[in-house]
Interface confidence: low
């Protein structure tokens, strides 16, 4: 009943709680003298479903037949109506539609730890919708049992609180959990176990780690585990991989030695425990362990390659540039590389340790034969030396890699295409294709790039630092034995119509043409490789077409003579530049008269 | 630089199908990714389709969500010709259509990534 009901009642036939599908009849009766005053005809008795009129019957009682109420908890309410009055609430009932539960599935048990207590889980199948009571029972041996219940709705685990021990371990013990509620019953299938069946170890714990002699090929994990573990599984990663490295170990006591860890990397471990070989489940994993495994001296050699600049009749500046080793090769943190630069016919050699760099300029003389040697050192030793004679790297013409073309291809990067040199092309022992920014001015500080190709490929695809709307210079090295050729062309990833147009900082006049001088674009509004510049002219104050003169891009370009225009006749000139993707606007206009009449 | 021909665009009925082409000169579409941009009368122009050239096999479609299922774009190397079949076109479909290549890779939708454009070809579909 869910109120006093002081005023009349409400039963429900067969019950209160009924198997879903079933039909309830539900009466409304009021107690003697609680109808409408004066007259009991007029009583108007009211059943609602929740909030909504189901029935209405003139009199001192109602009855109601009810079918298909839906699973969970239905509220009628029973009221009275008399005339020029607000309804009066009799009486109330809950109705609990439901079903019997079903059959307990998956019944399993779990120890955890040699010290920790058994628990059971089960699937209680599909909701009852009802107040549903689990018994769970254990039977051991020497006719023992344990009984624990559980009333939450939601019942599908229980925990006995009861040790089972090691003294017999092949002992059976048997769970069954039985289901009770007011439409039925139904017990698990049993299951019966043993210790050894159930206990699943306490996951390792105090996980150590130990390199020998600071060498990762000695290298010994230590850990502690419960009393009675007999395999372990160990499981270990750097930590920036997602594939784990697994390995299975018998009667470790808690030390395992691993042979195939990387020098200076980061590792994570982690640890797994279990009884018995084939009985019971295995432990979690352990917390892991991290730790850095110990530097080794670097293998493989640097990457090295270097750019010769005249400076005078007799010195000349060499820059070397070498590529960092990869992590597996530097095996630690690099202190330092060291170049040795050698004049091999006298024998003079210096020898200099670079520190945060990956790049060394110095000017040596023009004359002698000249080497160089760069390694990389770390706390435990030196990288083999990369040794390269220094030579001119273009000066074999026949050599020179032939039909060198630069596309776009794709973002940010450049497909390099070349046809081998005309000279036997079974000489070619590599070629390398070298790129940097193209700064008008032929920055040397400019950073270099550069990849080495096998001679048999005649294309290399370059995206190492190609930034988009910038113009890169690419050169294209064929190498074999102490000769080389080259050849060079502009190439850009993506490009679009200059920004600007070049600045006209000067019109002279020269014996009847002029020469007009200009200042570059800057880089970063020349929005790719520049191909050629236009010089337009009109008359002052003409509306006719301008003439133009377009002259190829070159980098060290900024004057040109032009010898078509009328003396005594005042012209405007401008330029614009023009990339693949077309024309810049008009640079600044400047006005010019021959004949010295220059405004 | 490629320079485009669109073709094949006419009066048609609700629900019928139509074939645009693209033919391009200048020089082959390697490399190129080629893009259907349409623009109807008062209203910006908006990204269709686009297919991307890898050397001479097509390595990449994208279509713009409110004709994926009906549109269909492909082309044909030989011919250096990318085309855009439209099938259950609807009344919302008249539009100018252009198209667009460029030798970028970067944002398939955005006009101002390409850099050779079309005249465009007239498509009306009559209700």
């Known amino acids: 009943k869910i109120d006093a009901c002081k005023r009349g009642d409400v039963t429900v036939k067969p019950s209160h709680v009924i198997l879903l599908g079933s039909t309830v009849n539900i009466t409304c009766s009021l107690k003697p003298r609680q109808g409408c005053f004066h007259y009991s005809r007029r009583n108007k008795l009211i059943l609602y479903k929740f909030d909504r009129r189901i029935n209405f019957h003139h009199g001192h009682s109602l009855n109601s037949q009810v079918t298909g109420l839906p699973l969970g908890t239905t509220l009628f309410v029973c009221k009275l109506a008399c005339i020029n009055s607000d309804e009066i609430q009799i009486c109330g009932a809950e109705i609990f539609v439901g079903v019997a539960p079903e059959q307990p599935q998956n019944l399993s048990c779990i120890q955890k730890g040699e010290q920790g207590t058994v628990a059971c889980t089960w699937e209680r199948g599909r909701d009852t919708h009802l107040y549903t009571e689990y018994t769970l029972q254990l039977s051991g041996p020497k006719n023992l049992t344990w009984q624990k219940q559980c009333k939450d709705i939601y019942c599908d685990y229980l925990d006995f609180g009861i040790n089972l021990t090691p003294e017999s371990p092949e002992s059976n013990f048997t769970a069954k959990v039985t289901a009770v509620n007011s439409l039925g019953s139904s017990s698990s299938l049993p299951s019966t176990f043993t210790f050894l069946d159930i206990v699943r170890p306490l996951p390792p714990w105090d996980i150590r780690i130990k390199f020998q002699k600071a060498s990762v090929s000695r290298c010994t994990l230590y850990w502690r585990d419960e009393g009675l573990v007999l395999l372990n599984r160990l499981r270990y990663r750097p930590s920036n991989s997602r594939l784990w490295n697994m390995v299975n170990v018998t009667k470790a006591k808690g030390r395992h030695d691993l042979l195939d860890l990387k020098p200076f990397t980061e590792y994570e471990f982690q640890i797994s425990s279990k009884l018995h070989l084939y009985k019971g489940s295995w432990s979690d994993w352990s917390e892991s362990l991290r730790a850095q495994t110990p530097e080794e001296e670097p293998t493989g050699m640097l990457d090295v390659w270097y750019m010769k600049r005249h400076i005078d009749y007799s010195r000349q500046q060499i820059s070397l540039f070498w590529k960092n080793l990869s992590v597996s090769e530097a095996r630690g943190k690099i202190l330092h590389y060291q170049v040795t630069l050698q004049e091999l016919t006298g024998g003079k050699a210096m020898t200099q340790n670079i520190t945060g760099h990956t790049s060394w300029t110095t000017v040596i003389p023009r004359t002698g034969n000249w080497a160089v040697a760069v390694s990389a050192a770390n706390s435990k030793g030196s990288s083999l030396p990369t040794r390269i004679n220094i030579m001119n790297l273009c000066e074999a013409g026949l050599l020179a890699p032939r039909q060198v073309s630069a596309n776009s291809e794709g973002m940010d990067n450049i497909l390099v295409t070349w046809q081998p040199p005309r000279k036997d092309p079974s000489a070619v022992q590599e070629y390398v294709v070298e790129w940097r920014e193209l700064h008008p001015g032929g920055d040397t500080q400019v950073p270099l790039n550069w990849l080495r190709s096998r001679p048999y490929n005649v294309s290399a695809l370059i995206s190492e630092n190609i930034k988009s709307y910038i113009c890169y210079e690419i050169r294209v090295y064929a190498l074999s034995g102490d000769q080389g050729g080259c050849s060079s062309i502009l190439g850009n990833s993506k490009h679009k119509a200059p920004l600007s147009g070049p600045h006209i900082n000067a019109i002279t006049e020269e014996k009847g043409s002029i020469l007009i001088s200009w200042n570059s674009i800057p880089v970063q509004e020349q929005m790719g490789c520049l191909l050629h510049y236009r010089i337009y002219w009109k008359e002052r104050d003409s509306n006719s077409q301008p003439q133009l003169c377009e002259i190829p891009y070159r980098v060290s370009q900024n004057s040109h003579p032009i010898n078509s225009l009328q003396p005594r006749v005042t012209y405007v000139l401008w330029m614009t530049a023009l990339t693949a993707a077309g024309e810049s606007s008009h640079g600044n206009e400047r006005e010019f008269c021959l004949q010295g009449k220059a405004n | 630089e490629v320079q485009l021909v669109e073709s094949g665009g006419r009066l048609v009925q609700a629900g019928d199908s139509l074939r645009l082409s693209c033919a391009a000169s200048?020089?082959?579409?390697?490399?190129?990714?080629v893009g259907w941009f349409r623009q109807a009368p008062g209203k910006e122009r908006e990204f269709v389709s686009a297919?991307?050239?890898?050397?001479?096999?097509?390595?990449?479609?994208y279509y713009a969500d409110s004709v994926k299922g009906r549109f269909s774009i492909s082309g044909d190397y030989a011919k250096n010709t990318v085309y855009l079949q439209m099938n259950s076109l609807k009344a919302e479909d008249t539009a100018v259509y252009y198209c667009a290549a460029s030798t970028s890779w970067g944002v398939l939708e955005s006009d101002t990534e390409y850099t050779s454009w079309g005249q465009g070809t007239q498509v009306t579909v009559s209700s």
């Open positions: 297919l991307r050239w890898s050397s001479s096999n097509i390595d990449y479609t």
């Open positions: 200048g020089r082959t579409f390697t490399n190129y990714r």
